[in-house]
Amino acid sequence: EEELQVIQPEKSVSVAAGDSATLNCTVSSLIPVGPIQWFRGAGPGRELIYNLKEGHFPRVTPVSDPTKRNNMDFSIRISNITPADAGTYYCVKFRKGSPDVELKSGAGTELSVRAKPSAPVVSGPAVRATAEHTVSFTCESHGFSPRDITLKWFKNGNELSDFQTNVDPAGKSVSYSIRSTARVVLTRRDVHSQVICEVAHVTLQGDPLRGTANLSEAIRVPPFLEVTQQSMRADNQVNVTCQVTKFYPQRLQLTWLENGNVSRTEMASALPENKDGTYNWTSWLLVNVSAHRDDVKLTCQVEHDGQPAVNKSFSVKVSAHPKEQGSNTAAENTGTNERNIYGGSG
């Protein structure tokens, strides 16, 4: 009598998550009487996957009709495969008994599950940074299998090289995660810039997944300040202008001080955007020269995005009665950084 053989023809089977997996098994003889069982793994901790004799296995169906006695095909189909189903499956023949006696096992079929990576999520720095500073962006994607994966970073379509990538876990697992951190040097022109994390995997059929982050969330472009005096008006009033240019974000508070005393505070709001994404703002202050005996020191104090205030001062010469003055005069930047005054964003 020939020795019973349990034949599992495939050493390995690879299936996409969500699909069905067919695990093939045939026996060379129907003798002796006894059940066939499928297990995942070997040894005492093995997991029963299907028992042709009994039990309820909703995701597992026999490929051939198990009620046909001359059927020697014990292949099974497992539906709706997930990464958790990965492992080596064994078809095992038992002799009927109490308990059933294991006679012979197939060589095993390794089921690997091809699972797509999740959409990459890119997160930027918690606080804004200014031009010439380096900021870090992190890209994460999870749940993919097999482990091999390619991740690239781009800034405005140009590939970046300064990044570090880790795939976890290092050993064998049902699915994997990738985390990459890229270092990006900011420039003043980066308000409209974008970083892209691109993930390529065998399951994506050459159509990589992308995650994006806008540098507008990470950058702060501090304003330039310029204070100028317009011509003296006939009513002895001087129009002094504070031009705040090229700043981002819009959150900005401007305070006028006359001889150190707060004259007016304004918040920027609904400003038109420059081509590069920055904003400009101009504020005017009318100074009544005849109401002052001495020269008036005007200060334009700007607090941008919660940063320490920046000032520009300008002296209006009262003694000179500059009624004939025709040209604008630019103020000097005092360079004084006064105590932060937080203003609302406009």
Epitope: E1, I31, I36, E54, P66, T67, K96, S98, P99
Partner: antibody, heavy 118, light 107 residues
């Protein structure tokens, strides 16, 4: 339709012989373990004999050496040759098919009556 | 040989009743226990195999349970056609053996 039909029963004297036949239809008899079960009048069921797919044979103690189970694949038939019959062999004899992987009985014939009496 | 002891040997019940018949094996038989129904003058009919699996065409009012040495057959709601004799059987090893039967009679 899967069916088993027994024949060959009748009245026989003690010490005599009888050959029971079981004709199978709707399936290939040689692919299944096949059995004979008997039931004495007013009594319970008693398993008598079996033949496996490999031709291996099994008997209950009281019939060993007297009864022989066999099959003829060409005729899709099962047989029970009964020799040295005794009064306590009197019973209805049923031909039974053993189920797929564990040999659980699934299909029964209608039975044939064997009476051993002088 | 493995002995199968069935109880009770007879049972009176009414239509609509739920009845349970038990069977004990003299040694462990895994779940290789079967149940049969027989009506007078007829061949037995297979009801349950591997302790709890219903043969095709058997109504779900019949259920079986147990493993090792103790097994039960339950009929959830008796109908007139269910009054018959019921047998348990072990088929783990030769010689296969039956219980002595339980006669279910109408009250």
């Amino acid at each position: 339709e899967v069916q088993l039909v027994e024949s060959g029963g009748g009245l026989v004297q003690p010490g005599g012989s009888l050959r029971l036949s079981c004709a199978a239809s709707g399936f290939t008899l040689s692919s299944y373990d096949m059995h004979w079960v008997r039931q004495a009048p007013g009594k319970g069921l008693e398993w008598v004999s079996a033949i496996g797919t490999a031709g291996d044979t099994y008997y209950t103690g009281s019939v060993k050496g007297r009864f022989t189970i066999s099959r003829e694949n060409a005729k899709n038939s099962l047989y029970l040759q009964m020799n040295s019959l005794r009064a306590d062999d009197t019973a209805v004899y049923y031909c039974v098919r053993g189920g797929v992987w564990d040999d659980a009985f699934d299909i029964w014939g209608q039975g044939t009556m064997v009476t051993v009496s002088s | 040989d493995i002995q199968m002891t069935q109880s009770p040997s007879s049972l009176s019940a009414s239509v609509g009743d739920r009845v349970t018949i038990t069977c004990r094996a003299s040694q462990g038989i895994n779940n290789y226990a079967a149940w049969f129904q027989q009506k007078p003058g007829k061949a037995p009919k297979s009801l349950i195999y591997t302790a709890s699996s219903l043969h095709s065409g058997v109504p779900s009012k019949f259920s079986g349970s147990g493993s090792g040495t103790d097994f039960t057959l339950t009929i959830s709601s008796l109908q007139p056609e269910d009054f018959a004799t019921y047998y348990c059987q072990q088929y783990v090893s030769y010689p296969y053996t039956f219980g002595q039967g339980t006669k279910l009679e109408i009250k």
